[in-house]
């Protein structure tokens, strides 16, 4: 399990407890409710991209 206050993830990534791996912060605009997005710098809101036509 991930130790508190540590991060095995590279820059631009954040640990997902749900998926048990590092995930790309770039995916947070598309899936902002993902657990790992809390560990990412504020991501642009989804409306910057036309993800829901």
């Amino acid at each position: 399990e991930q130790a508190p206050g540590t991060s095995p993830c590279s820059s631009g990534s954040s640990w997902s407890a749900d998926l048990d791996k590092c995930m790309d912060c770039a995916s947070c605009p598309a899936r902002p409710h993902s657990d790992f997005c809390l560990g990412c710098a504020a991501a642009p809101p989804a409306h910057f991209r036309l993800l829901w036509p």
Epitope: M23, D24, S27, P29, A30, R31, P44
Partner: antibody, heavy 120, light 111 residues
Framework: EVKLEESGGGLVQPGGSMKLSCVVS????????MSWVRQSPEKGLEWVAE???????????HYAESVKGKFTVSRDDSKSRLYLQMSSLRPEDTGIYYC??????????WGQGTSVTVSS | DIVLTQSPASLVVSLGQRATISCRAS??????????MHWYQQKPGQPPKLLIK???KLDSGVPARFSGSGSGTDFTLNIHPVEEEDTATYYC?????????FGGGTKMEIK
């Protein structure tokens, strides 16, 4: 190890129907977006359909314009299976159909593909 | 729809040299934070394999001789030094909006 295995392809006459299946293992299937992408020498790689997860907008589906009203994508999270129901098939629907799993954006996991031929 | 134009359509590269493949989008696929362009490698008889995501981030297990760059509408895949196993067709793909689209591919041979 992540594995995606398509089945259901084959030869079908123009106007006919076919249902493709994809079984996924090694992945928390219910959390991943899934797509079908087809490939032919004429059109190259062509995205066909996508289904998102139940927690994101109730498993929203999206389709390429060329297959809207003809193809239906669905998923069964309890069986880790993805489906593509195809109807009113035309010769231009011929190709290799790939099942793909991804969290968002980049298409991480691809199956080996199943071949669909529409011909009389 | 966003059209992705790859160039060249094919190229022959000497072993150990640098290969450069370009992908141009018909509109920007970048925000101030991220670029939504990805690169795939496909070998004969195999499905495409993700190489680079978000323009420059190597997927896990991809050798460091692969690199990606670019933003807005112009993106580049570089391979250096090229190895024999890199013989394949390379595709770009955007995830800016639906429909997701792919480039026409660049077939690379090694001499």
């Amino acid at each position: 190890e992540v594995k995606l295995e398509e089945s259901g392809g084959g030869l079908v006459q123009p106007g006919g129907s076919m249902k493709l299946s994809c079984v996924v293992s090694g992945l928390t299937f219910s959390r991943y977006w899934m797509s079908w992408v087809r490939q032919s020498p004429e059109k190259g790689l062509e995205w066909v359909a996508e289904i998102r997860v139940k927690s994101d907008n109730y498993a929203t589906t999206h389709y390429a314009e060329s297959v809207k009203g003809k193809f239906t994508v669905s998923r069964d999270d309890s069986k880790s299976r993805l489906y593509l129901q195809m109807s009113s098939l035309r010769p231009e629907d011929t190709g290799i159909y790939y099942c793909i799993g991804y969290y968002a954006d980049a298409m991480d996991y691809w199956g080996q593909g199943t071949s669909v031929t529409v011909s009389s | 729809d966003i059209v992705l134009t790859q160039s060249p359509a094919s190229l022959v590269v000497s072993l150990g040299q640098r290969a450069t493949i370009s992908c141009r989008a018909s509109q920007s696929v970048s925000t101030s934070s991220y670029s939504y362009m990805h690169w795939y490698q496909q070998k004969p008889g195999q499905p495409p394999k993700l190489l680079i995501k978000y323009a420059s981030k190597l997927d896990s297990g991809v050798p460091a001789r692969f690199s990606g760059s670019g933003s807005g509408t112009d993106f580049t895949l570089n391979i250096h030094p090229v190895e024999e196993e890199d013989t394949a067709t390379y595709y770009c793909q955007h995830s800016w909006e639906i429909p997701w689209t792919f480039g026409g591919g660049t077939k690379m041979e090694i001499k």
